[in-house]
Amino acid sequence: FSGDGRAVWSKNPNFTPVNESQLFLYDTFPKNFFWGVGTGALQVEGSWKKDGKGPSIWDHFVHTHLKNVSSTNGSSDSYIFLEKDLSALDFIGVSFYQFSISWPRLFPDGIVTVANAKGLQYYNTLLDSLVLRNIEPIVTLYHWDLPLALQEKYGGWKNDTIIDIFNDYATYCFQTFGDRVKYWITIHNPYLVAWHGYGTGMHAPGEKGNLAAVYTVGHNLIKAHSKVWHNYNTHFRPHQKGWLSITLGSHWIEPNRSENTMDILKCQQSMVSVLGWFASPIHGDGDYPEGMKKKLLSILPLFSEAEKNEVRGTADFFAFSFGPNNFKPLNTMAKMGQNVSLNLREALNWIKLEYNNPQILIAENGWFTDSHVKTEDTTAIYMMKNFLSQVLQAIRLDEIRVFGYTAWSLLDGFEWQDAYTIRRGLFYVDFNSKQKERKPKSSAHYYKQIIRENGFSLKEATPDVQGQFPCDFSWGVTESVLKPESVASSPQFSDPYLYVWNATGNRLLHRVEGVRLKTRPAQCTDFVNIKKQLEMLARMKVTHYRFALDWASVLPTGNLSAVNRQALRYYRCVVSEGLKLGISAMVTLYYPTHAHLGLPEPLLHAGGWLNPSTVEAFQAYAGLCFQELGDLVKLWITINEPNRLSDIYNRSGNDTYGAAHNLLVAHALAWRLYDRQFRPSQRGAVSLSLHADWAEPANPYADSHWRAAERFLQFEIAWFAEPLFKTGDYPAAMREYIASKHRRGLSSSALPRLTEAERRLLKGTVDFCALNHFTTRFVMHEQLAGSRYDSDRDIQFLQDITRLSSPTRLAVIPWGVRKLLRWVRRNYGDMDIYITASGIDDQALEDDRLRKYYLEKYLQEVLKAYLIDKVRIKGYYAFKLAEEKSKPRFGFFTSDFKAKSSIQFYNKMISSSGFPSENSSSRCSQTQKNTECTVCLFLVQKKPL
């Protein structure tokens, strides 16, 4: 007997995945993996007193203990609608169907005499139909529905008389059905039978408080199972050649602190007191776990040596149940002060270590949804995906011998103490309907797909391509607002006098009279901050640097009456010094953040972007910047992420849309000004950058989610792109959606009406498309009331825990960027596109492997868009140069300017212009890469500061 389970908790507690394969395995299950689905007789059969069926303890318990439930009759009526169940099984394509026989349907008072004919006919028909369809039956003899007569006459499982009666019942089933059944389960989850039936009273027969009874029941269940196993082994296995086990259920638990021995011992104790209670005698050494014997002393019945030998090894495989029933209610669980967890992979590892690597059938797995959820059970898909991913990793990575999986349950039905308040089926059943149609839920479609593919195939990805970006591709890095230094930090060359130090021994400087030195003019390198920026940029080896000006520093009053020349000089220095390194600037005029709107104080106090005067002020500010810096700057962004800024004005949807309107007009006016006044001489390009995450339907089987994903893109990107890139007006889809909500009284929001003049003003005011892309969001439709932008969209987001994601929960989904680029081209035509910010937060301060993985995978998808989809992608700007203190770590440099290892990785990307094949050399010489700014360099050298 092994008993090594405790080692499971010694894994590295600080492990955070840095690539997808460490978190989710795209792979198949073993050939001939056994895929199935399960039900319990009491839960789905209905007809609780029809055709001679006797009452069970649960039929009685429902009437006496459960509020608002009259009987189990309202369930899915499988007894009547057998054909519908068979069609449902056909739909999914399972290899097996696990169901239970209702003991009182065969023998109404529990004693084996002549079987109830109608009951016998039902199970015979079911078995024959399964065999005909090539679906293997896995039959459970006891799934909690003890004949009431046995409870009333003997006290149920408290009385060891039941052991022989159960064995008689099992013998009948082996004799009658064994020719068609190769897999038998004696008892489903005996822990719950004992613990909730006799401890908490939450299950039938509803007795509670008597711990001795709990462990007596457990003892009798083990002995009953053992007796049946020996019976099958001796009398039936030789000719029926089947397998028999008992389904044991458990939770999983994680230590509060993985290095605290006592926490780990408590976790072990927790598992042993639930799963070990039954598994230790049956799969272990024939006896209860040591810890239980020590703790429970006289309460726990003893096994004699003969009984230990009798019980030990009485299972042909380990049948394991992992579902909500073992996690409810939390206050009755054996948590030992530790943390309950749904980590099925770890639970399987524990079983492997504790019970010597048995063959495992997952005999029940799944979660639940609320009763109001019909066929769109999106969370159920993700729970299933997560569980199946863990099973696959257990098989492939941990070498655990799982040979089959039972999704629970086939149908919605009666859920024990929860009655009809939750649903666990892959098929939706309206319990109030006459015909009880089985409607496949999204989870049924998903499971069907898993079975068809025998696992998880990587559908989303086109294989990686080898190739390079064009030679004039902008390899950039983005920084947010650069705060200008108000005073040059090195004024030592502006004083014309000569000094001697310590001439009289007083350690002071003495001016030498009559000597005047030539001072040198102020230089850009006087700004210490700029030196830091340049050092970092030089190490990045980028061709472009995107940074933002601080509007409030340049124009403290918000108008041209007080221009901060020192600030402008500082920015000019940043650009000119960069050009000396061959780095061109992409300058953002206005870069608001959620914490700080970045507006000059007077404009902020006047209402910010809700006040049209801010629009005029912005135009004037833009003109000043074009005039002062435009000879050196050839790429301009007017406003960074106006589609996010407007969120700040979220008191109402109308505020949001009003602010957005003013931002659009401000941008358009700035663009028109540049076009008219500056483009002829400066020959630059102007745009605005939009936050542009991609959206996928959280539930690909739900039309409403596909519509929600497109709606997200309309509300997020098209809201600004449509007026500027295309029509001069807001997207029709967005306008109509808000209007329809308005009409139905669900929102008082309305998009502003644009005049013909405004439409003409807005339309076409972009020279390129600038997108900030970080992640892909999984969206679902949810009707939301209220008059805010967020509720107008009727969208909720779902976090897929099986996806690699960053500390701030940004999912790493590389293919999203390619889909975005294709969507933009399809909607707005063939234009130059720059990804003006793209990056991930990574906790690592030195070896930021998540960032490297992100860069590699996202750039690979951008390259596919360029090479395969022919998208005119002109540049990629990684976000961001340096991180800010106590903010998410997006930087290539730490807040104290220490370089991270992703810098070398990005350098290599830049020097090879992408992903060249091994034998191809870099096609681009350094001069070609920076063709854009030979003129700029000339100007830098000639123009005084």
Partner: antibody, heavy 118, light 107 residues
């Protein structure tokens, strides 16, 4: 470098108490436990008890219960073991050792000799 | 308490020899046994835990095996720095207990 540095040798009279300290460095003190083990001349090693610094979980060997007290001062990254009602058979080298989750000791102190003699 | 019996209590060997030390528990301790090395003037050094897991930084000539009640520490090719006393410790249940030690001396 992860290390545990213990206080110096002590000579005590029977009936007195001794308090041995163990200063940790090179790792996050609160993430691990400290065990105390002693080795009397010619005797085998004997585990006395354990403290998990993060939440002050303490477990004592029943043999020493009532006589041994294990404490810690997180601000000083130091664990202490106090043994009272000393007798001559308590003469031993006392070790502190960092405890890992599975109950093994991966870093040991250099040992503190305690002599109990009248 | 679980009694740990180590054998032999001492042995003489030469550099390059294969050395085996055994440790027996009075009842099953699963695989939760650690081995460590004690040398005068040095701090004790963990070699193996959980029966067979080599502690990081420990040379691969050290290996552990066994489970239940019988365990073995093997040094595949004895090196000059390996002459020391070796102890086993069960870390299966409180109180943790130790073997009596095996002194490995130069032949």
């Amino acid at each position: 470098e992860v290390q545990l540095v213990q206080s110096g040798a002590e000579v005590k009279k029977p009936g007195a108490s001794v308090k041995v300290s163990c200063k940790a460095s090179g790792y996050t003190f609160t993430n691990y436990g400290i065990n105390w083990v002693r080795q009397a001349p010619g005797q085998r090693l004997e585990w006395m008890g354990y403290i998990y610094i993060g939440n002050v979980d303490i477990e004592y060997n029943a043999k020493f219960k009532g006589r041994v007290t294990i404490t810690s001062d997180t601000s000083a990254s130091t664990a202490y073991m106090e043994l009272s009602s000393l007798r001559s058979e308590d003469t031993a080298v006392y070790y502190c050792a960092r405890g890992r989750g599975l109950g093994h000791f991966d870093v040991w102190g250099q040992g503190t000799t305690v002599t109990v003699s009248s | 308490d679980i009694q740990m019996t180590q054998s032999p209590s001492s042995l003489s060997a030469s550099v390059g020899d294969r050395v085996t030390i055994t440790c027996r528990a009075s009842k099953s301790i699963s695989k939760f046994l650690a081995w460590f090395q004690q040398k005068p003037g040095k701090t004790n050094k963990l070699l193996i835990y959980s029966g067979s897991t080599l502690q990081s930084g420990v040379p691969s000539r050290f290996s552990g095996s066994g489970s239940g009640t019988d365990f073995t520490l093997t040094i595949s090719s004895l090196q000059p720095e390996d002459f020391a006393t070796y102890y086993c410790q069960q870390h299966n249940e409180y109180p943790w207990t130790f073997g009596g030690g095996t002194k490995v001396e130069i032949k």
